[in-house]
């Protein structure tokens, strides 16, 4: 056969030979040559590769440090990483998730509008007129001001996107 | 026609040289790696070498190592196994054998090695 | 070194019987396992490459398949001339080794 000068998907081209890529959880341990096939080994415990390869070491997993406040969330295989999230309360201070930091709170008069995850972070919004935050919470969204009329109580006291209104009895009518 | 032939095997003391050659036509020499394998009276295959198509890189079991030299001349199409320091284990029959997608795909009649005292 | 080893060592038949032989290794070799067959007084031929793939001029009878450790070679039918020795052989690495035989024979 002549002398390739590209080989097929999954092949790597060395010495003038196509020679086999090592499967994902594999690494190169000698090229092919006109004899032999290309010579793998499986990854050791806590090493992954995720992609057909010629490495001739594995990658070694992703440690999720408690003192960054990291915990697995996935455990990595031979073909896959580990992946790490953030402990309750916290989240990721970026995509590859390497380090935590505590979910935001809420100021008084900001609710929650989309409560943290792992990965991404508390959401705040300014109560609109008729609804009130009156503490800091990374949970509590704008509660509705008190319908005083509900109660047969008028508003003593206006609300304000802090604080609720306050209600009080009916002036009687003397007669 | 693919054709390997083996020549000069013979019979020789322990501790004597011999030269085996094997003369290829049919096909181009120049673009096969070539393996020698050997068989024993009780029938076993064993690999005894291998060289690479343009001969720079050669391959030996350990049992052989030091004692055999695979070697080959393209433009005369021939195959050699220079042995050296034998042994009455090394007793066998010598095949040379082309390596067509890694699998010995063509093999001579061989040629017959016997040490003995 | 891989280890090859061939089971059984003498198989004794009566032609048109279909048979199974079989090749272990000592180790994973993925497909990277030939068959060869030595009829009395003659050289190996290739019969069988990369444990399943068949060769031109090899009557289709002769299969072969198995991954990993495990491999067998079937006869669908076996002829008069099939009868002979039967080698596997590795090349997942070096040494190059070869299994000790599976002699089929008359019975």
């Known amino acids: 056969p002549e002398p390739p000068t590209a080989c097929r998907e999954k092949q790597y081209l060395i010495n003038s030979q196509c020679c086999s890529l090592c499967q994902p959880g594999q690494k190169l341990v000698s090229d092919c040559t006109e004899f032999t096939e290309t010579e793998c080994l499986p990854c050791g415990e806590s090493e992954f590769l995720d992609t057909w390869n010629r490495e001739t070491h594995c990658h070694q997993h992703k440690y999720c440090d408690p003192n960054l406040g990291l915990r697995v969330q996935q455990k990595g295989t031979s073909e896959t990483d580990t992946i790490c999230t953030c402990e309750e309360g916290w989240h990721c201070t970026s995509e590859a998730c390497e380090s935590c930091v505590l979910h935001r709170s809420c100021s008084p008069g900001f609710g929650v509008k989309q409560i943290a995850t792992g990965v991404s972070d508390t959401i705040c919004e300014p109560c609109p007129v008729g609804f009130f935050s009156n503490v800091s919470s990374a949970f509590e969204k704008c509660h509705p001001w008190t319908s005083c009329e509900t109660k047969d109580l008028v508003v003593q006291q206006a609300g304000t996107n802090k604080t609720d209104v306050v209600c009080g009895p009916q002036d009687r009518l003397r007669a | 026609e693919v054709k390997l032939v083996e020549s000069g095997g013979g019979l020789v003391k322990p501790g004597a040289s011999l030269k085996l050659s094997c003369a290829a036509s049919g096909f181009t020499f120049s673009n096969y790696g070539i393996s020698w394998v050997r068989q024993t009276s009780d029938k076993r295959l064993e690999w005894v070498a291998s060289i690479s198509s343009g001969g720079d890189n050669t391959y030996y079991p350990d049992n052989v190592k030091g004692r055999f030299t695979i070697s080959r001349e393209n433009a005369k199409n021939t195959l050699y196994l220079q042995m050296s320091s034998l042994k009455s284990e090394d007793t066998a029959l010598y095949y040379c054998?082309?390596?067509?997608?890694?699998?010995?795909?063509?093999w001579g009649q061989g040629t017959s090695v016997t040490v003995s005292s | 070194d891989i280890v090859l080893t061939q089971s059984p060592v003498t198989l004794s038949v009566t032609p048109g019987d279909s048979v199974s032989l079989s090749c272990r290794a000592s180790?994973?070799?993925?497909?990277?396992l030939h068959w060869y067959q030595q009829k009395s007084h003659e050289s190996p031929r290739l019969l069988i490459k990369y444990a399943s793939q068949s060769i031109s001029g090899i009557p289709s009878r002769f299969s072969g398949s198995g991954s990993g450790t495990d491999f067998t070679l079937s006869i669908n039918s076996v002829e008069t001339e099939d009868f002979g020795i039967y080698f596997c052989q590795q090349f997942s690495s070096w040494p190059l080794t070869f299994g000790a035989g599976t002699k089929l024979e008359l019975k």
């Open positions: 054998a082309r390596a067509g997608e890694k699998a010995m795909d063509y």
């Open positions: 180790q994973t070799i993925n497909n990277n």
